[in-house]
């Protein structure tokens, strides 16, 4: 068991330009507050759960009304530490959220108004009974300048809070096996006090007066070998004449869960599954309600309607997770069409659209002929967010202006001459070539492969292509 | 919305079985524990069985009255909630109804089981 | 096992303000219980009103509320209707455990 304690140096505008408006004005005097969440270790599935290792709300501190035209100075703060007791081990990872709150006292209907100010997030390795850690952090434009600690309640001590220390009975030194209690030297690491009688060999314990069975173990002092031997009832008495011996209650036998915690066994003990609101090695750490206010960056509180829910946070656009703790990456749901660029801006989603595109989401597709005119008759093809011309012949370019050299593609095969033509071009074949681009060889019978030239026209004659 | 619906109701023989089935859809079933209550003709409310979600260990309750009678299960998977009711009593002749509790209640429709002989 | 028990009939008028009451024989209903209440109008229609003791579903007129009173979970109408006319349950958690009120059975004149 120990305690958490974090101590709030300051709360002001952060370093740069933009510096952040006061949030109190002598119209809207004000106060501040923080909470603080910590959840064990520092995996992401952290994000989604309640704030399991606890959760702590501040004093509100002195009164404080803006003077008019000064920049937003460091902020009054409540007086004294933020501390979040713990009873179980410290976990050595944590995470942590922080959130300045202001209070409003103007005349508001209903008593104060709060809202959020600024929330910091972070995840950090700590070891109980070390120094205090310093740490800054920043929220837009603000910053928070704050330290920590963990320190354990005596007797625990350790970097988890897990080894008791007890006074020395000798002055000098302590007992067979046990180590002076650092940093308190002049105690000395007591040993669990274990179920009298306990199996030293096969027993163990993780609280003081119980006596818990290595596998393969039974009785209430470890002292029973388990058979292996087939025996009539699933759980029940030993019979001593057989030396047959059935296991005797588990340790999830009467569920040791309290407040509707699930029991699971493991190998050495049982772990309990707690519903939301509860913690603890046997959920019997009541935690969270609504009156804690464990609703992040604005959530709406309200109590559920199920033991599994004791409470619903209500998220605001933008957050998520069971204490809307979670920022949403709205820009991963591709809400913006047609290759639009998507925007987070924290209030509000902004899509960057593509050239052809408009619409909050780029989702109309703008008339890429509209007020587009081809120049010299060509038609306009819309496609792709751009428009693109169909030129008439003799003409090229984006819009058709430009006027084409249709011989510049060097369009006659076999060696035919190209003339540009008003409406095309014309090829002058080779002999033994005809067509419209020289294309088809003339037989050497004098007879062609296409039919016959049109009349006024005899193979070999340019051809005109149409 | 949240839609919630019975089917497997039936005319059933005392000492008999039946299986009743309830398809969710509209929300994240597999986050949420679930319940089955009942209404006898003429009578009030009576809760049957609950299931909590798969952190929880799926773990089940009972009402006294049904007690290793009835088994509730889930499949997550096609968001499913079932009731196996074995040795059928007169007494469970009921309108049984799928319930969800979150931050209210949420009813489905109902299924009619009658057991006569 | 608790017992849950409400008034078996109440009688109000249009307009005038009607307190339904949930008392647990196991002691003070807390906000723990989750208190939870039903309208069940004919033909076997239910309709979730308050989650949680005070939470009200969406599409459910402002006049229900819900609300601990003294040792007891309540649930207030505010300037009844004729379309209020129904049996009211109120439901109770005990850990996993729920138990039901025989139910109220609510006229409107």
């Known amino acids: 068991a120990g305690v958490f304690e974090l101590q709030i140096h300051s709360f002001g505008p952060g370093p740069g330009p933009g510096a952040p408006r006061s949030p109190c004005s002598a119209r809207l005097p004000c106060r501040l507050f923080f909470r603080v969440c910590l959840k064990p270790g520092l995996s992401e599935e952290a994000a989604e759960s309640p704030c399991a290792l606890g959760a702590a709300l501040s004093a509100r501190g002195p009164v404080y009304t803006e003077q008019p035209g000064a920049p937003a100075p460091d902020l009054p703060l409540p007086d004294g530490l933020l501390q979040v007791p713990f009873r179980d081990a410290w976990p050595g990872t944590f995470s942590f959220i922080i959130e300045t709150w202001r209070e409003e006292l103007g005349d508001q209907i209903g008593g104060p108004a709060w809202s959020l100010l600024a929330r910091v997030a972070g995840r950090r390795r700590l070891a109980a009974g070390g120094p205090w850690a310093r740490d800054i952090q920043r929220a837009g434009a603000w910053e928070l300048r704050f330290s920590y600690r963990a320190r354990c309640e005596p007797p625990a001590v350790g970097t988890a809070c897990t080894r008791l220390c007890r006074p020395r009975s000798a002055p000098s030194r302590c007992g067979p096996g046990l180590r002076p209690c650092a940093p308190l030297e002049d105690e000395c690491e007591a040993p669990l006090v274990c179920r009298a009688g306990c199996s030293p060999e096969h027993g163990f314990c993780e609280q003081p007066g119980e006596c818990r069975c290595l596998e393969g173990w039974t009785g209430p002092l470890c002292t029973v070998p388990v058979s292996t031997s087939s025996c009539l009832s699933p759980r029940g008495p030993s019979s001593a004449t057989t030396g047959c011996l059935v296991p005797g209650p588990g340790p999830c036998d009467g569920n040791p869960c309290a407040n509707g915690g699930s029991c699971s066994e493991t190998p050495r003990s049982f772990e309990c599954t707690c519903p939301r609101g509860f913690y603890g090695l046997r959920c019997e750490v009541s935690g969270v309600t609504c009156a804690d206010g464990p609703c992040f960056n604005g959530g709406l509180c309200v109590g559920g309607a199920d033991p599994d829910s004791a409470y619903i946070c209500h998220c605001p656009p933008g957050f998520q997770g069971s204490n809307c703790e979670k920022r949403v990456d709205r820009c991963s749901l591709q809400p913006c069409r047609n290759g639009g660029l998507c925007l987070d801006l924290g209030h509000a989603l902004r899509c960057r659209c593509r050239a052809g595109f408009a619409g909050p989401r780029c989702e109309h597709d703008l008339d890429d002929c509209a007020g587009r005119a081809c120049a010299n008759g060509g038609t306009c093809v819309e496609g792709g967010g751009a428009h693109r011309c169909s030129c008439a012949l003799g003409f090229g370019g984006r819009d058709c202006r430009e006027r084409a050299d249709p011989c510049a593609a060097r369009p006659c095969a076999h060696g035919g001459r190209c003339y540009a033509h008003f409406s095309g071009l014309v090829c002058a074949c080779a002999p033994g070539y005809m067509g419209a681009r020289c294309e088809f060889p003339v037989h050497p019978d004098g007879a062609s492969a296409l039919p016959a030239a049109p009349p006024g026209l005899r193979p070999g004659d340019p051809q005109r292509y149409l | 919305e949240v839609q919630l619906v019975e089917t497997g109701g039936g005319l059933v023989q005392p000492k008999g079985s039946l299986k009743l089935s309830c398809a969710v859809s509209a929300f994240t079933f597999t986050t949420y524990a679930m319940n089955w209550v009942r209404q006898a003709p003429g009578k009030g409310l009576e809760w049957v069985a609950r299931?909590?979600?798969?952190?929880?260990?799926?773990?089940?309750y009972y009402a006294d009255s049904v007690k290793d009678r009835f088994t509730i299960s889930r499949d997550d998977s096609q968001s499913m909630l079932y009731l196996q009711m074995n040795n059928l009593k007169i007494e469970d002749t009921a309108m049984y109804y799928c319930?969800?509790?979150?931050?209210?209640?949420?009813w489905g429709q109902g299924t009619l089981v009658t057991v006569s002989a | 096992q608790a017992v849950v028990t409400q008034e078996s009939a109440l009688t109000t008028s249009p307009g005038e303000t009607v307190t339904l009451t949930c008392r647990s024989s196991?002691?003070?209903?807390?906000?723990?219980?989750?208190a939870n209440w039903i309208q069940e109008k004919p033909d076997h229609l239910f309709t979730g009103l308050i989650g949680g003791t005070n939470n009200r579903a969406p599409g459910v007129p402002a006049r229900f509320s819900g609300s601990l009173i003294g040792d007891k979970a309540a649930l207030t109408i505010t300037g009844a209707q004729t379309e209020d006319e129904a049996i009211y349950f109120c439901?109770?958690?005990?850990?996993?455990?729920?138990?039901f009120g025989g139910g109220t059975k609510l006229t409107v004149l």
């Open positions: 319930v969800f509790y979150y931050d209210y209640v949420y």
């Open positions: 196991t002691g003070a209903v807390t906000t723990s219980n989750h």
């Open positions: 299931i909590r979600n798969k952190s929880n260990n799926y773990a089940t």
């Open positions: 439901g109770l958690w005990y850990s996993n455990h729920l138990v």
